[in-house]
Amino acid sequence: HKCDITLQEIIKTLNSLTEQKTLCTELTVTDIFAASKNTTEKETFCRAATVLRQFYSHHEKDTRCLGATAQQFHRHKQLIRFLKRLDRNLWGLAGLNSCPVKEANQSTLENFLERLKTIMREKYSKCSS
């Protein structure tokens, strides 16, 4: 069967997000991937979206992320724009209303996005073969 267009959009957005660092890609987020053995795919997507939403809600107007120059401000705005797009598409793929995120482990946003990209690429390779 064909891959969902949303999945392709997610991978495209993740590629954009992981190609370049910004002032805040080194900040930490909850690492939902550290112990996700008994988690369904839909739950994983839902929880990933929850983590991203927590991040951009907390840091969208964070002065450390907005930086001191118009250039840094622009990059942060782009980062937030992509995170919101990713969040929206992940919710669509998950099809769940809410999900708990209780893990204590942390990872940088950069590493979180890389891990999510790996998972999405694996999913894409399965559905496209």
């Epitope: 370049q20 660092k21 118009a70 250039q71 401000f73 782009q78």
Partner: antibody
Amino acid sequence: QLQLQESGPGLVKPSETLSLTCTVSGGSISSESYYWGWIRKPPGKGLEWIGSIYYSGSTDYNPSLKSRVTISVDTSKNQFSLKLSSVTAADTAVYYCARGGASDRIDHAFEIWGQGTMVTVSS
Amino acid sequence: DIQMTQSPSSLSASVGDRVTITCQASQDISNYLNWYQEKPGKAPKLLIYDASNLETGVPSRFSGSGSGTDFTFTISSLQPEDIATYYCQQYYDLYTFGGGTKVEIK
């Protein structure tokens, strides 16, 4: 296809203000994903970034030129402009306008440039 | 301010030769490094962005590598049309160009 065109006087007297305009065609200057810059190349020297302006109107300037530079945007005319005050012979250069940024990336290089306009500072 | 030190300032090579230009940043700039080609009377042309990505339509003989502070630009087989001045440019923190490397044919 997006094109940029610089315009303005080719000769400016010392101590006066150099004024150039860049007209953008084939695309909107108002996109949130892109920004606009000025770069110059003095004869026999290398490229020098002058400054950039973003869709919000916020600007960044080269620290070495900051006290003399103003960049502004006119969205109604799809143009952005450069003003460089108190010019000297050292400001003689080819002046380029360019577009940076991208809709599918966090940031991108200045990839689209105008053809450049030569400005000579002389009395 | 971030300084970009480019070397050599000029070089002469034969058609078919491998040409290498280096660029060193005064501080870590991650992969925010571009390479431009400038020919006399023409606007600079973006060849490589983010240290190693080939801009669309640019011949594959051009390549770039590096991250952090040290970067390399390579022309695998020099062609007559490659006669130009090449510049590195950081855009990690504002924008700074290297001094340029003038490439000539022997």
